[in-house]
Interface confidence: medium
């Protein structure tokens, strides 16, 4: 039997054991988060699968993910949303300590998909473990990119109160309009629910002289946010290690001075 022709994409293929990983993560999440104990993980996997299986992987839409989004509906208390851009690791360390704040990856759907890749093939029930479309080289409407765009939009839309965003001060563009934060989340914060956006600009080392809140890209972010009738604040986090430590132990004497 001749092997069936398979589309070759530029990106890496579906993460090995993808179905098992998603199902296991779902079970673990619902066990740890009592408010989600009603979630049927088999239904979640079926909805996830239904979003991309048998579909041309360059023609995925946000609509494809709506059944999954519906099953994974979760609310974050006001003032407790933490967005991030190009600094996922620190944002996640922060919410591991500050347990009452949440990144997208602390929510069920973000947790299920974090660091995973997936895609299917048109008109077959197979998962493509060989290659998946690359956002730049192949297409932007691929299963992974559309998923993150969909859930990021929803996460931003449901945020309320003061929303925080962690930005990487080591980058040439501290605020990047092409990032998920810059292209999706910023534009989906709801002015009638969100009073303010507070940016935390994370410095890369011990050089505490520069005020990165004066960076032109931060001014651009301030302009975008202000035009949407949301107040904007910015803080330099000069010592990220101290910042994490002081979140853990705010009473420490060294935390009374600036971080």
């Amino acid at each position: 039997v001749l092997p069936r022709w398979r589309q070759q994409w530029s990106g890496s293929g579906t993460t090995s054991r993808f179905p098992e990983t998603v199902l296991a993560r779902c079970v673990k999440y619902t066990e740890v988060h009592p408010e989600m104990r009603h979630v049927d993980c088999q239904s979640v996997w079926d909805a996830f699968k239904g979003a991309f299986i048998s579909k041309y992987p360059c023609n995925i839409t946000e609509e494809d993910y709506q059944p999954l989004v519906k099953l994974g509906t979760q609310t974050v208390p006001c003032n407790k949303t933490l967005l991030w851009s190009r600094i996922k690791d620190l944002a996640h360390q922060f919410t591991q300590v500050q347990r009452d704040m949440f990144t997208l990856e602390d929510m069920l759907l973000g947790y299920l998909a974090d660091d995973l890749t997936w895609c299917g093939e048109f008109n077959t029930f197979e998962i493509n473990y060989q290659s998946c479309p690359d956002w730049r080289k192949d297409c932007s409407n691929n299963p992974v990119s559309v998923f993150w765009k969909t859930v990021s939009r929803r996460f931003a839309e449901t945020a309320c109160g003061v929303v925080h965003v962690m930005l990487n001060g080591s980058r040439s563009k501290i605020f990047d309009k092409n990032s998920t934060f810059g292209s999706v989340e910023v534009h989906n914060l709801q002015p009638e629910k969100v009073q303010a956006l507070e940016a935390w600009v994370i410095h890369g080392g011990r050089e505490d002289s520069r005020d990165l809140c004066q960076d032109p890209t931060i001014k651009e972010l301030e302009s975008i946010i202000s035009k949407r009738n949301i107040r904007f604040f910015c803080k330099n986090i000069y010592r990220p290690d101290k910042f994490l430590q002081c979140v853990k132990n705010p009473e420490d004497s060294s935390c009374l001075s600036g971080i």
Partner: antibody, heavy 118, light 109 residues
């Protein structure tokens, strides 16, 4: 592949000088604070010096202050340690290691041996 | 004499759980994040734990914790390949320096 490669070690007489280099590959060198850590034969790890991402801040262990100078060239992805007025107690394997302030020193070189002896 | 104090040696049999302690002061362990490094014989140190987290590739048998001015590294399900020297490290605000523990030599019996 992410790696650091040290060079420049060798045998030198007390009072002599050496310059160690550490070449970085596979990561954005200019995003990381860099360090030199040494280990004397049969002993534990001892921090020697650190330099911030652009080089505006440097720190030294008391044992090397005034004798060693750390520097970096971000355009060449290279870290340096100029060691002057070397003493027998400076004999050690010298490692360079990168540092991100919420990660720790997560990439280490293989080390270069400095022997100070007459 | 190291600023951070570790026991010079520790041992355990395969499958056992072993804990290595690291004692310091408010200017280092209490006020800053603690890292743990593993050094296998004849090799460079390797980051094992940062901020009580494991870098990718480090087995979940290794865990770190901190309480006040002390930190500890726990290794469960001990394996022969865990035989190595283990070092704790933290930034010291008073010394303006990285400080390391003297190291603990772990023997798997």
């Amino acid at each position: 592949e992410v790696q650091l490669l040290e060079s420049g070690g060798g045998l030198v007489q007390p009072g002599g000088s050496l310059r160690l280099s550490c070449a970085a590959f596979g990561f954005t060198f200019s995003d990381y604070e860099m360090n030199w850590v040494r280990q004397a034969p049969g002993k534990g790890l001892e921090w020697v010096s650190s330099i911030s991402i652009t080089g505006s801040w440097t720190g030294y262990a008391d044992s090397v202050k005034g004798r060693f100078t750390i520097s970096r060239d971000n355009s060449k992805n290279t870290l340096y340690l100029q060691m002057n007025n070397l003493r027998a107690e400076d004999t050690a394997v010298y490692y360079c290691a990168n540092y991100k302030s919420y990660y720790g020193m997560d990439v280490w070189g293989q080390g270069t041996t400095v022997t100070v002896s007459s | 004499q190291s600023v951070l104090t570790q026991p010079p040696s520790a041992s355990g049999t395969p499958g056992q759980r072993v804990t290595i302690s690291c004692s310091g002061s408010s200017s280092n362990i209490r006020n800053n994040l603690v890292n743990w490094y593993q050094q296998l014989p004849g090799t460079a140190p390797k980051l094992l734990i940062y901020n009580a987290q494991r870098p990718s590739g480090v087995p979940d048998r290794f865990s770190g914790s901190k309480s006040g001015t002390s930190a500890s590294l726990a290794i469960s399900g001990l394996q022969s390949e865990d035989e190595a020297d283990y070092y704790c490290a933290a930034w010291d605000d008073s010394l303006n320096a990285w400080v390391f523990g003297g190291g603990t030599k772990l023997t798997v019996l």
